[in-house]
Structures are given as structure tokens and as C-alpha cells.
Interface confidence: low
């Protein structure tokens, strides 16, 4: 399938002009290669009419141009002074020959319709209303006023001043006069449909002295806006229907032959195919709303329509807006697993892609919730503290520059199953959806920490060990100290990794962390994990409580689980100490309205990047005070 996309059908009238936009995939080669517009002949040949190399055919001389917009990955063909001879089949395309990548465009140029010379033309969109102005002479002021619609043989009454109304216009047509002006009457017709298009005559008085006026009402279906999106990316349908439908239920539907199947509406209807990857967001009181769909699939391509009606369903005679969505399969967005599986008590590491050109953008992870119109509350972000209920088990690791950040969630429960979104405050196309499935664990976890009930005594030495199976022998093992800004990796050195896999002794594979002497700041959550380069694997978590040794009893109550920790992990026996940077609470991230919730996802504000160290591997600073720390293998 060709990745070039444009309008399938273009219609115009003689003497007018058209502007045809064609889209191409975002690659350097495509931006610089030849663009062309050619006309298809009966023989199957496509004759070039204009190209970006400067070629212009004789029949287009002085009336056409082709402009490339590499920053938008589009090129535009403008053709003026159209004649009926321009009607035909064309291709817009890329390549050195006209057999390259292309898209078929049908152009139809009609004759200007013959109308009586005094005809007033009203052009309105479907669902809108029109007010027709009907002037008359003062002597016809007392006479009957009417509007009729011309049919083949006669003129069928629409409405008159005696309150007669054609059944098709009941509740839609009103005849009125303004103030004391006795020389003009008005007819307003609302909820316009295609059937309302045609010639009308308004009349005041009867017989030869009657005042008549010809009116041509054109009711247009909205021109579909073309949307060119990459596979796996996201799309936002911005729907602006006007204040008159501000209080009606809103919907987005996809055309399916004669009907339009509702995908989502504000009354809670949602197509199961879009579960976990769609939100509908009312924007304001003026009838504006947006629908965001992430994780675009091939089958999402098609003709979409938004509208408003109390039923939340498409209705004739109500305003609509339309789009033609093209899903480009030559996507720049990497093909990642869309389903991640974990087990209860275990962990998952989710690799989230982002636009590598935007490595300094703020990264977020949110959980999609389907209730109401759908929303996605942020759980963690590069400058968003972890939500309280995820304390000690969720962290975001940013790996600047490589186009991926990792979110790790451990201590899984079946309630964690659901849909999650990776997103940044930068390029919105890179929003991706992950479905997390959590099954009941059927075996022991790969990583185990001993002792499991870890209570360290102030001023004493405390060691915890993380046991791992031989299959992890070649991977890097790490301990990190969790805080609500990330999990700061503690420098470590794993002797186990130097053994050959043949001599791997299952019972001796462990990485230990020793606190010596234990301080109050050491209290908190610690993770033991494995990783290979920048690819994070399994983790397990342990909470270390710190208690004072007292005379009467062995321990006192542990302090707040959120206390900041000063934890070190060193090779062998080296006198030094490691502590985290000061953790000042960073206010909520601002790209989303409604606190931590992704609501107005369509217009995220760009944030200034603060100098937080969340998730960095070097979030510790060395202090000068000495302390013994042992790291055993």
C-alpha cells in the first residue's frame, strides 16, 4: 500500500481554483526527492503536468504551481482558472519517474449552474441554519408573505405568514419581521439537511403586483480534513461545533457504508476496539471538544465524523465535522510490545518510546481509566512525584538520548492489570498504550531478598542480600534506594557476573548491601534489580525500618516510611559514603489540567525543564564523612 495520501475526490466549478495537499512519510529521502502531479490516460500512462524539478506543462502554463513543505511532509498543487476539461483522474506522487509512490485523485469541474439573474445564493453547512431575507414594497405590507421551494412542476410551500408549515419544516422554519421595518420579512430554517438544498422563491402579495425573490440554498457537507498519522502514533480530532450545541451530548463516529458507527460519546458509549486508547475531552462552553486515540492501528484508517445531539448519536440536520484519517505503515515509532505480562508479587519493566529529538522533554506514565469520558491520571513522571498508593513500587528511569525511558512497577497485584500510557510534554504523536496483564504467580520469584522483615538498628551494621538465579549471571545486578522522585542506583560491583555459566553455583548467587553504621536516613524502600546495559529487567523491593536500641525494650516504632535515605553500596571495604541529593518536593507537573490528570491532552503546555534528578543513575553526591560499607558476592 502506498504511503502517499491526499484527497480522493476534489470538486470545483469552472473559473474557480483548487488546492490539493498530498502527504508523504517523514524521511530525509522523501523530503528531497522529486514531487509530481500527473494526469492518468486511458492507456494507463500518467503524463506529468507539473513537478518540483521545475517542469510545467503547456496546459498548466501560468495557472498552476507545486510547492513542497518539507517541514510538514506535504506538497501542495494549486491550479487556477479551472475548465471542464480539467475533469479527470490524476496522481500526486514522489520519485524520479511517475511510477513511484503515488495517490489517486479524482478532479471534477462542473459548469456554473444557470440561475435567474436576481438569484441570491446562500451557502450553509449541514446542521446549521439560514436566514433568508425577502424584501417587498410597502403596498404589499398587509399581504400574505411566503417561502416556497421549487420542484420540477411547482413551488411547494415551506411556510407562510398564516402559520401554514410544510410537515418537513415543522419546528425548523420560522417566518418573522424585525422591528418596525415593513419592507422586508425573514425566513429562518434550522437543522439544514441535504434535502433542503435547492431553489426557493419568497413572495409578498398575490398576482402581478406581488414581490418575488429567487433564492438558491446550497447545503454543503463539510470538507473532510485530511489527517496523516504513523502506525502506533496518536491522533487528536479537534471538534468545534459552535455554541448552539454546547449543551448537547458529543460523539465521534466512523463511517461504515451508509451508517456512522459511534466510537465514543459523552454519554459513556465506547467501541470495545478502542478500549484503553481513547479519551473524549470537553474543551469549553462553546461546543468545542477533542477525542484522542493512541496506539493507531492499520484498521483505524477511515472517515470520521464528530457531532452533537442529545442522544449522543449521529442525527440528520445537526452540525458535523469530518476527517479522513490515513495510517502510514512506514512508521518512525518503534514496534514495541503492546501487551506486557506480569505475575502477582513480581515486577514489570516497560520501555516507553519517545521522539529521540526531544530527549529533554518531560516523561510521564499514566493509567487509563474508562469511567465517564475516559481519563488518564499521571502515576509518575520525570518531575512528578509518584502517587502515594504506588509508594515503594513504581519508578521512572530516564535514559537521555536513546529514545526510550523505562517505567518499573513491582509488588504487582491483579488490580494493577489495565491500560497505561507512555507520554511526554513534547511530540504528542509518540503517545503509546500498554496493556498490563497480571496472572497469579505459580512459582517462586526470580529475585529474593533476605532477611524479609528488615529492621536495622541505629548505629549498628545491617546487611541485606539479594539472591538471583544463574540465568541472570551475565546481567548487571544493582541495588537502588527508592524515593518518590525515582530509584537512585547505588554504585555496585558484582563478582557473580565474572563466573562462567558452567560453574554457576545456584546457592551462592547473591548481591549484598551493607549499611554501616545505620543512620536514620537509611530508612525506606530499596530495590534489587537486574539490567543489561540500558535495558531494565526484574526487580524486587524491601522496606528497611530503622529503630533505636532502648534499655527497656529492643526497639521503638519505625519513623515515617517516606524519610529520606542516605545509603551507600561500595566495592569491598572502601572508606567513603554516598548520599542522595537533597530531595525538595517538586510541584505537580503542568502539562495537564485537573491536577495530575491528562485531560486537555491536545494542548499541553511546554514546561521549563527543572533540574530534578529523578531516575538518574548518578543521583548521589559523595560526602566527606567516612563510613564502612561492604558489598558481598
Amino acid at each position: 500500500k502506498s504511503p502517499i495520501f491526499g484527497p480522493q475526490e476534489v470538486s470545483s466549478i469552472e473559473g474557480d481554483s483548487v488546492s490539493i495537499t498530498c502527504y508523504y512519510p517523514d524521511t530525509s529521502v522523501n523530503r528531497h526527492t522529486r514531487k509530481y502531479w500527473c494526469r492518468q490516460g486511458a492507456s494507463g500512462m500518467c503524463t506529468t503536468l507539473i513537478s518540483s524539478n521545475g517542469y510545467l506543462s503547456k496546459e498548466y502554463s501560468g495557472r498552476a504551481n507545486l510547492i513542497n513543505f518539507p517541514e510538514n511532509n506535504t506538497f501542495v498543487i494549486n491550479i487556477e482558472q479551472l475548465t471542464q476539461d480539467d475533469t479527470g483522474s490524476y496522481k500526486c506522487g514522489l520519485g524520479t519517474s511517475n511510477r513511484g509512490l503515488s495517490f489517486d485523485v479524482s478532479l471534477e469541474v462542473s459548469q456554473v449552474p444557470e440561475l435567474p439573474s436576481d438569484t441570491h445564493v446562500y451557502t450553509k453547512d449541514i446542521g446549521r441554519n439560514v436566514t433568508i431575507e425577502c424584501p417587498f414594497k410597502r403596498e404589499n405590507a398587509p399581504s400574505k408573505k411566503s417561502l416556497c421551494k421549487k420542484t420540477n412542476q411547482s413551488c411547494e410551500l415551506v411556510i407562510d405568514s398564516t402559520e401554514k408549515v410544510n410537515p418537513s419544516y415543522i419546528g425548523r422554519a420560522k417566518l418573522f419581521m424585525k422591528g418596525t421595518d415593513l419592507t422586508v420579512f425573514y425566513v429562518n430554517i434550522s437543522h439544514l439537511t441535504h434535502n433542503d438544498a435547492g431553489l426557493y422563491i419568497c413572495q409578498a402579495g398575490e398576482g402581478p403586483s406581488a414581490d418575488k425573490k429567487n433564492v438558491d440554498l446550497q447545503v454543503l457537507a463539510p470538507e473532510p480534513e485530511l489527517l496523516y498519522k504513523d502506525l502506533r502514533s496518536s491522533v487528536t480530532f479537534e471538534c468545534d461545533l459552535g455554541r448552539e450545541v454546547a449543551n448537547e451530548a458529543k460523539y465521534l463516529c466512523r463511517m461504515n457504508k451508509e451508517t456512522c458507527d459511534v466510537i465514543i460519546n459523552t454519554l459513556g458509549k465506547r467501541d470495545p476496539d478502542f478500549e484503553g486508547r481513547i479519551l473524549i475531552t470537553p474543551k469549553d462552553d462553546n461546543g468545542r471538544f477533542s477525542v484522542l486515540i493512541t496506539g493507531l492501528r492499520k484498521e483505524d484508517a477511515g472517515h470520521y465524523q464528530c457531532g452533537a445531539h442529545s442522544s449522543g448519536l449521529p442525527q440528520e440536520g445537526w452540525p458535523i465535522q469530518t476527517w479522513q484519517l490515513f495510517v502510514n505503515e512506514e512508521s518512525t515509532i518503534p514496534n514495541r510490545r503492546s501487551v506486557v505480562k506480569g505475575v502477582t508479587g513480581g515486577s514489570v519493566a516497560i520501555a516507553c518510546p519517545y521522539n529521540p529529538k526531544e530527549s529533554s522533554s518531560l516523561k510521564y506514565w499514566c493509567r487509563w481509566e474508562g469511567d465517564g469520558n475516559g481519563h488518564c491520571p499521571v502515576l509518575v513522571g520525570t518531575q512528578a512525584q509518584v502517587q502515594e498508593e504506588y509508594e515503594g513500587r513504581l519508578a521512572l528511569f530516564d535514559q537521555p538520548g536513546n529514545g526510550t525511558y523505562t517505567v518499573i512497577l513491582n509488588q504487582l497485584t491483579t488490580e494493577d492489570a489495565g491500560f497505561y500510557w507512555c507520554l511526554t510534554n513534547g511530540d504528542s504523536r509518540w503517545r503509546t498504550t500498554i496493556e498490563l496483564q497480571v496472572a497469579e504467580a505459580t512459582r517462586e520469584p526470580n529475585l529474593e531478598v533476605t532477611p524479609q522483615n528488615a529492621t536495622a538498628v541505629l548505629g549498628e551494621t545491617f546487611t541485606v542480600s539479594c539472591h538471583y538465579p544463574c540465568k541472570f549471571y551475565s546481567q548487571e545486578k544493582y541495588w537502588c534506594k527508592w524515593s518518590n522522585k525515582g530509584c537512585h542506583i547505588l554504585p555496585s560491583h558484582d563478582e557473580g557476573a565474572r563466573q562462567s555459566s558452567v560453574s554457576c553455583d545456584q546457592s551462592s548467587q547473591l548481591v549484598s548491601m551493607t549499611l554501616n553504621p545505620v543512620s536514620k536516613e537509611d530508612e525506606g524502600w530499596y530495590w534489587c534489580g537486574v539490567k543489561q546495559g540500558q535495558t531494565y529487567g526484574e526487580t524486587t523491593a524491601i522496606y528497611i525500618a530503622v529503630e533505636e536500641r532502648t534499655r527497656g525494650s529492643s526497639h521503638v516504632n519505625p519513623t515515617d516510611a517516606n524519610a529520606r535515605a542516605k545509603v551507600a553500596l561500595e566495592e569491598e571495604v572502601v572508606d567513603s559514603s554516598i548520599s542522595e541529593k537533597e530531595n525538595k518536593a517538586i510541584p505537580n507537573p503542568g502539562p495537564f489540567a485537573n491536577e495530575r490528570e491528562i485531560q486537555n491532552v491536545g494542548d499541553q503546555a511546554q514546561e521549563n525543564r527543572a533540574s530534578g534528578d529523578a531516575g538518574s543513575a548518578d543521583g548521589q553526591s559523595r560526602s566527606s564523612s567516612s563510613k564502612h560499607h561492604h558489598h558481598h558476592h
Epitope: I170, G171, R172, E258, T259, S310, P314, E316
Partner: nanobody, 116 residues
Framework: QVQLVESGGGSVQPGGSLRLSCAAS????????IMWYRQPPGRQRELVAD????????TYTESVKGRFTVTRDNAKNTVYLQMSGLKPEDTAVYYC?????????WGQGTQVTVSS
């Protein structure tokens, strides 16, 4: 004065059929949006099906697709809901609704009970 009168409800065994009628006065059903709603016991009212003025598009809620059909008899100014393959979860009071001139009009409802 717009009036909608539903009839045709009753008790039926699972798998059975019923035809509900919605007779309208004060409006012309051929140019109105007519909707069938139902309210199962102790639950919220939900949209079952609708038919728009052109008659081109009829929308059915997922749970009734293929089993329920809406038809319209313009001469009798009546809209029908043909229900077949009835299930116990279809038990509800069924209401006819007309959307005309930006106003919603409701009938009094008719009870449908599906049980063995």
C-alpha cells in the same frame, strides 16, 4: 400536544418474541428522531435503538444487535420495536422517546418480562 403511547409489552419465555408499538400524535414520526429506551429494575435508563428522520440510519446498542429491529409505519404514525431471541436481561420497562424541535417527549412505558 405531543403524545406517545407504548403497547405490546408482556411476559415471555427466554428465546421468545414481542413487538412493541409506539403510537404518536402531535408529531409526524416520518420527520422525527424516535428512540427506544429501557429501564431494567433498579438500574438507569439506557438507549436501546433509534431511527433518524431519513430512516437511513438505525443504531442499536451492542447487547440487542441482531435481535431487535426498529420499523416505522408513516401512515399509522407509529414506530415498532420488534424483539426476538429475548433474554432474561432484556426484562425492563420500555419507553418510546421522540426528539422534536429540540424537545424530548416520553411515553408512559410498557413492561417486558422475560423469565422461564
Amino acid at each position: 400536544q405531543v403524545q406517545l403511547v407504548e403497547s405490546g409489552g408482556g411476559s415471555v419465555q427466554p428465546g421468545g418474541s414481542l413487538r412493541l408499538s409506539c403510537a404518536a400524535s402531535g408529531i409526524d414520526v416520518s420527520i422525527s428522531t424516535i428512540m427506544w429506551y429501557r429501564q431494567p429494575p433498579g438500574r438507569q435508563r439506557e438507549l436501546v435503538a433509534d431511527v433518524i428522520p431519513s430512516g437511513r440510519s438505525t443504531t442499536y446498542t451492542e447487547s440487542v444487535k441482531g435481535r431487535f429491529t426498529v420499523t416505522r409505519d408513516n401512515a399509522k404514525n407509529t414506530v415498532y420495536l420488534q424483539m426476538s431471541g429475548l433474554k432474561p436481561e432484556d426484562t425492563a420497562v420500555y419507553y418510546c422517546n421522540a426528539f422534536v424541535r429540540r424537545e424530548n417527549y416520553w411515553g408512559q412505558g410498557t413492561q417486558v418480562t422475560v423469565s422461564s
